[in-house]
Amino acid sequence: GWVWNQFFVPEEMNTTSHHVGRLRSDLDNGNNSFQYKLLGAGAGSTFIIDERTGDIYAIEKLDREERSLYILRAQVIDITTGRAVEPESEFVIKVSDINDNEPKFLDEPYEAIVPEMSPEGTLVIQVTASDADDPSSGNNARLLYSLLQGQPYFSVEPTTGVIRISSKMDRELQDEYWVIIQAKDMIGQPGALSGTTSVLIKLSDVNDNKPIFKESLYRLTVSESAPTGTSIGTIMAYDNDIGENAEMDYSIEEDDSQTFDIITNHETQEGIVILKKKVNFEHQNHYGIRAKVKNHHVDKQLMKYHTEASTTFIKIQVEDVDEPPLFLLPYYIFEIFEETPQGSFVGVVSATDPDNRKSPIRYSITRSKVFNIDDNGTITTTNSLDREISAWYNLSITATEKYNIEQISSIPVYVQVLNINDHAPEFSQYYESYVCENAGSGQVIQTISAVDRDESIEEHHFYFNLSVEDTNSSSFTIIDNQDNTAVILTNRTGFNLQEEPIFYISILIADNGIPSLTSTNTLTIHVCDCDDSGSTQTCQYQELMLSMGFKTE
């Protein structure tokens, strides 16, 4: 049979040829004519056999990391017979490892983020080096990690490459560190190869700084004319933290007047002092308020850094503004009876200069021919007023400062014209009545109603009567219905169209005013030739035709 041991070739041999071993048949006693042959991938190129002895040589430099074993075939032939002495056999040449590869950090670049102020022992990142050498071959690929740069803040576990924090770090002092890790093979023994990698370790922010006002006193000014909601200035605190941890909220800590507010501009992290109520220079020309600032987000475990909020004092000076005159009332309502003579007193308006100089005031009425105002604010009539023409007047009174005619204020003044009983009641419409020749006594000829242009304080009540002459000789009579209407009735039987075709009745209508007024109203009554039914319709039709120029038979 074949006789051989395991074949090994050290990689990276610099000699032109290296004896690997010898193929031998146990039938070969040295005196036989045995020829050995080598076949397979690498035979004749990487490996050469001395066919006379069976000695195998490697003639190329081998790289185990490229190829770690070769599978070849061996033959042995007796040249005297040309026959195989042994069956062809497969054998392996293993390339043995030498420490020719340094550790490499394949996952470079390394970057890690760890919160500032993390305690000792906090895991940062694990770096791993790879060594292409044979891990089963001694210590060629057994690595030890060490820290070349990064003390005293970091440490590395020698066998795992785990980087840990060894000293607390403050991001506000330094926000990133370059750590250099070395990996050595041969577990660091002499002849070891090494590789290094750089790790960028960034400290992430924790909220370990409270915001602090840049100034202990701020001086702001506000115009007394500023409307509510006006921004009167900004205050600013600084926070050494970043991002969310530097977001802050400003608030009022003291403001007895409750005149101001502070809102936070979350983009600029400024506090904006806002006017909550209007200020009046003449009332109070300066204010003192205290503001405080706190972080928006604070973790419970970091509360120790935020125990006392930073405060600042804000002095606010009110700036005087030349203000327009100020009326005592926002509007006035005056009353005056109608029919009073011109020059009658209506009422007095009053405006003053709110500023300290107290300018005299001049008054005027905008576009009015009915009223006048003097420099004392007294309003009088320029004409007699008729309530039945206009019961209300809406005036615009303007007050102008004498020292600064641009300072003007206007207010509405409403003048109500009060009623007096200066109108008698009268027919509510024109009445045209008809009576048949054959009408009987007591027949209703017309219902009448009245109106009065005067205003009724309570309710109008009208009294209807025939005039004295009509009462004495009337063919008609009147009945007051006591509801501001009355009915006219025939006071006889039969009428003669030929003799008296039309009657004119004078009706007296009195109101219940004080004093009472009475008017005389004429009612025209036409006598008609009626049909047997006593209908006045035909009579009314005839009247219509006559009024239109037609004659009826």
Partner: antibody, heavy 120, light 108 residues
């Protein structure tokens, strides 16, 4: 045309070591077997051994204990060292080319030979 | 090892004569792996025949080889003046390689 040339000392003292070099010209040393043969004065030829270009050697059992051969392909040279010399080692030493790969072959070409005398 | 015996030790012939040299092996030589060399005084041997019967390049055809197993013959059909020399046989069928003691062909 391949030519071989032996070189070395002509005279060596007994018990010393002989070192001879054969320089190959006109062709490459690689791919061939190279032999040393000696011929004592007035006697027949004796094969000393060969060296293959890869460094493999095979020596005549009668001399094996005293012989070492080496090869330097970069210089196109191969060498013979023979230790513990006696007068019986006095001979003309030839270098010759054997075959290329495979079984033994005849010798061709030969160097012209160099006479080595072992004498005190 | 294979011992080769050459006979005769000396062969005295005249030019033009036929020379027959014998080489006997102590055991069979594999595949007729036998060579013949010619050596003149002060010179290196020169290959004549290999494989028992094949002429080397440039060798005149008056030289011929024959034989197998243990008996081998070198024949020079008509000796030329330059043919007078010592002739060696060598077997290369087994290790170690061995030479015969040589036959000297001299002018009669």
């Amino acid at each position: 045309q391949v030519q071989l040339q032996e070189s070395g000392p002509g005279l060596v003292k007994p018990s010393e070591t002989l070192s001879l070099t054969c320089t190959v010209s006109g062709g490459s040393i690689s791919g061939y077997y190279w032999s040393w043969i000696r011929q004592p004065p007035g006697k027949g030829l004796e094969w000393i051994g060969y060296i293959y270009y890869i460094g493999s050697t095979n020596y005549n059992p009668s001399l094996k204990s005293r012989v070492t051969m080496s090869i330097d392909t970069s210089k196109n040279q191969f060498s013979l060292t023979l230790s513990s010399l006696t007068a019986a080692d006095t001979a003309v030493y030839f270098c010759a080319r054997d075959g290329s790969s495979g079984w033994y072959r005849w010798f061709d070409p030969w160097g012209q030979g160099t006479l080595v005398t072992v004498s005190s | 090892e294979i011992v080769l015996t050459q006979s005769p030790g000396t062969l005295s012939l005249s030019p033009g004569e036929r020379a027959t040299l014998s080489c006997r092996a102590s055991q069979s030589v594999s595949s007729s792996y036998l060579a013949w060399y010619q050596q003149k005084p002060g010179q290196a041997p020169r290959l004549l025949i290999f494989g028992a019967s094949s002429r080397a390049t440039g060798i005149p055809d008056r030289f011929s080889g024959s034989g197998s197993g243990t008996d081998f013959t070198l024949t020079i059909s008509g000796l030329e003046p330059e043919d007078f020399a010592v002739y060696h046989c060598q077997q290369y069928g087994n290790s170690p390689l061995t030479f015969g003691g040589g036959t000297k062909v001299e002018i009669k």
